[in-house]
């Protein structure tokens, strides 16, 4: 009996009610592998999800997030609201980054500007809500024979952002 079921191709299921005949998957269902005893219900892309690929008898539907949202999780299982650069998402909506913090993405959270002085450098370009500061060379970097070693990771002071 098991052998009969294993002959059922993708897009069908092994119908126990009909002497294990291979029956086509009903509408809005699919089987992506052979030998299945049931077909899986197609994923529905609704609400903040939009359809990227329609369901077929052999493959599930694939979803994306609607405009203004971005995907999280495997196969875009979650959608999270976008914000503008210079903002972060809170429960009360998109909030501007606090002074001294920035976010250069449409998702994620604000983080503090680099503290140039912790690396013995000076601020070359001021930071904004959307961009980190640019640190200028320290006096030692400008002296003759100065090392051209790779600078360390940016030093930061702990900051906080609104919620």
């Amino acid at each position: 009996l098991q052998d009969l079921c294993s002959n059922c191709p993708a897009g069908t299921f092994c119908d126990n009610n009909r002497s294990q005949i291979c029956s086509p998957c009903p509408p809005n269902s699919f089987s992506s592998a052979g030998g299945q005893r049931t077909c899986d219900i197609c994923r529905q892309c609704k609400g903040v999800f939009k359809t990227r690929k329609e369901c077929s008898s052999t493959s599930n539907a694939e979803c994306d997030c609607i405009s203004g949202y971005h995907c999280l999780g495997a196969e875009c299982s979650m959608c999270e609201q976008d914000c503008k650069q210079g903002q972060e998402l809170t429960k009360k909506g998109c909030k501007d980054c606090c002074f001294g913090t920035f976010n250069d993405q449409k998702r994620g959270i604000c983080r503090p500007w680099t503290n140039c002085s912790l690396d013995g450098k000076s601020v070359l370009v001021n930071g904004t809500k959307e961009r980190d500061v640019v640190c200028g060379p320290s006096p030692a970097d400008l002296s003759p024979g100065a090392s051209s070693a790779t600078p360390p990771a940016p030093a930061r002071e702990p900051g906080h952002s609104p919620q």
């Epitope: 999280l72 495997a74 959270i109 990771a153 906080h160």
Partner: antibody, heavy 116, light 108 residues
Amino acid sequence: QVQLVQSGAEVKKPGESLKISCKGSGYSFSTYWISWVRQMPGKGLEWMGKIYPGDSYTNYSPSFQGQVTISADKSISTAYLQWSSLKASDTAMYYCARGYGIFDYWGQGTLVTVSS
Amino acid sequence: DIELTQPPSVSVAPGQTARISCSGDNIGDQYAHWYQQKPGQAPVVVIYQDKNRPSGIPERFSGSNSGNTATLTISGTQAEDEADYYCATYTGFGSLAVFGGGTKLTVL
């Protein structure tokens, strides 16, 4: 597809140092936060801290500040968790996870055993 | 930083409704997320942003969050729902994430 693959299990003695890793693939590693989460044997999940690999900005839970160091090398899409001097109480499963609030992808975990 | 308190265990008969609470000062001001963890596995999101269910998570899972309590509700609980459940939140002040202590759900 997105994956976080962690380094293998470690057995260490108290006082030894250790650095475990979490390699991301299938997404823009530099622009997503990576968090580290501890789970002691038979206990719950504890958020340790996070790093933004793009510029290596880190932020620690007060409970773990000064106890561990989180770092990243964006050129090889890898985040690290390290100890300079392990204690028996550091014995736990350590997970890396993508995100800062919603942790949508998790590594398989690295079991760290510290015993004399 | 905010502390999240969960009951250590909850028991429910198959087909009945399980409710797992997560209490913390003004947790309703932040998003609450819920994770399911089965033995030997990494956690999985079952509810995000208070009440949203990821695709692939059964409709019997739902969530709410207001005041000092977030709640995960599992309607028509099934044996496969037996697991540990953790609430979590992210607080922008201090930029910290925190997990609740976890609740072991037993399906009798």
